[in-house]
């Protein structure tokens, strides 16, 4: 979380935003609050982004105002126009790019004063991971799948039984670059696995954590997957 | 509510440059929240994007026609205007111009459209 | 640039009916999509927008679902008024592009 106060000049106003990660492709959302003011039209919004140097966004006298928006966030970025009078500046961005990446700066004017507070965005690739029995093995073999990640993750198996067990003997792990030559499949296969035990394939990179877990039993199987993103800060 | 006109002449000659001007009445083309676009629709067939254009004049074409179009906008007239060069009859259709959403980027309302054919 | 396939080509439906219509995209566009309705001689009019969300005067029966690369538009009882072509477009990226179209004609 990051809080950042006014400058100079008229009060201060108390501005929030909090470090997010956006998954490539998909649509992301960089949080901003502040202190609401009673009018619209005195709420300025500005978004900026270090090293860029037109505007990502900017939303004055209740409505956006583009013309000093840089070229690759155009027909890209919405602020909800409705939530702003209740100090929510947060921007909506559109298929997040790799290069979306870095530090940007939520800028507010009210009637009250001014205000601003970074936020570092992340941009990776990440995705549910899905384990499944695999039949046409000669053994007893699980199939861990995950469609998108970036970068490289690391592929790491468990078991409730063998707490502690290192199963990177009997696992294979490999990455497979997806068509748009930036994200990869993961596909990671457990040999020699057991009845009556839940395994889990955890996957990591420096943006997400995601587990997949799956208990076998002689009359069924539970599947379970879970995803996390790291390093969620507010400022 | 909102209505916009597209306008110019109906027939053009094979190699020589398409050109429509779009009226919108209802509101103002300054609004900050919306670009304008041109959209065109060859007969019988589907939709094509052809660009858009904001109030302040910063423009975005579809890159298979880029470098043909040229828009521009008059804001004291209200208007938006689109010029097509080198027009072959592939470039015969009906002409639309709409309001299009700054994100999500829909397009509402269209003018009623133009066709404009391409023919010596 | 991104490819909308739209299925079928012509839907025939009796009035009262439900009418399913398809689009599909070549890569994922979340859920940045748009459904649209021509009629005859007519502009095409806005529906539905962000995948799901219905244009304010557009009737209940209209509904848009789907995300990634599949999507659906659904009429859930026809009227006599809702015989025309449905478009979709995507907005993900730029250029937009537009399906080519289904045909929903009386049975």
């Known amino acids: 979380l990051i809080i950042g106060f006014g400058i100079s000049g008229r009060h201060s106003i108390t501005v929030t935003t909090v470090a997010s990660a956006g998954n490539i492709g998909e649509d992301g959302i960089l949080s901003c609050t502040f202190e609401p003011d009673i009018k619209l039209s005195d709420i300025v919004i500005q978004w900026l982004k270090e090293g860029v140097l037109g505007l990502v966004h900017e939303f004055k006298e209740g409505k956006d105002e583009l013309s000093e928006q840089d070229e690759m966030f155009r027909g890209r970025t919405a602020v909800f126009a409705d939530q702003v009078i209740v100090g929510n500046a947060s921007l909506r961005l559109k298929n997040v790019q790799l290069t979306d990446a870095g530090t940007y700066k939520c800028y507010i004017i009210t009637s009250k004063g001014k205000g601003n507070a970074n936020l570092e965005y992340k941009t990776g690739a990440f995705s549910m991971p899905e384990v499944n029995v695999d039949y046409n093995a000669s053994s007893e073999t699980l199939r861990c799948e995950a469609p998108r990640w970036f970068p490289q993750p690391t592929v790491v198996w468990a078991s409730q039984v063998d707490q502690g067990a290192n199963f990177s003997e009997v696992s294979n792990t490999s990455f497979e670059l997806n068509s748009e030559n930036v994200t990869m499949k993961v596909v990671s296969v457990l040999y020699n696995v057991t009845i009556n035990n839940t395994y889990s394939c955890m996957i990591e990179n420096d943006i997400a954590k995601a587990t997949g877990d799956i208990k076998v039993t002689e009359s069924e199987i539970k599947r379970r997957s879970h995803l996390q993103l790291l390093n969620s800060k507010a400022s | 509510q909102l209505q916009l006109q597209e306008s110019g002449p109906g027939l053009v000659k094979p190699s020589e440059t398409l050109s429509l001007t779009c009226t919108v009445s209802g509101g103002s083309i300054k609004s900050g929240s919306h670009y304008w676009g041109w959209i065109r629709q060859p007969p019988g067939k589907g939709l094509e994007w052809i660009g858009n254009?904001?109030?302040?004049?910063?423009?975005y074409y579809n890159p298979s026609l880029k470098s043909r179009v040229t828009m521009s906008v008059d804001t004291s007239k209200n208007q938006f205007s689109l010029k097509l060069s080198s027009v072959t009859a592939a470039d015969t259709a009906v002409y639309y111009c709409a309001r299009e959403g700054s994100y999500p980027n829909w397009f509402d309302p269209w003018g009623q459209g133009t066709l404009v054919t391409v023919s010596s | 640039e991104i490819v909308m396939t739209q299925s079928p080509a012509t839907l025939s439906v009796s009035p009262g009916e439900r009418a399913t219509l398809s689009c599909r995209a070549s890569q994922s566009v979340s859920t940045n999509l748009a459904w649209y309705q021509q009629k005859p001689g007519q502009a095409p009019r806005l529906l539905i927008y962000d995948a799901s969300a219905r244009v304010t005067g557009i009737p209940a029966r209209f509904s848009g679902s789907g995300s990634g690369t599949e999507f659906t538009l659904t009429i859930s009882s026809l009227q006599s008024e809702d015989f025309a072509v449905y478009y979709c477009?995507?907005?993900?990226?730029?250029?937009?592009?537009f399906g080519g179209g289904t045909k929903v004609e009386i049975k």
């Open positions: 477009q995507q907005y993900h990226s730029f250029p937009f592009t």
């Open positions: 254009i904001y109030y302040s004049g910063s423009t």
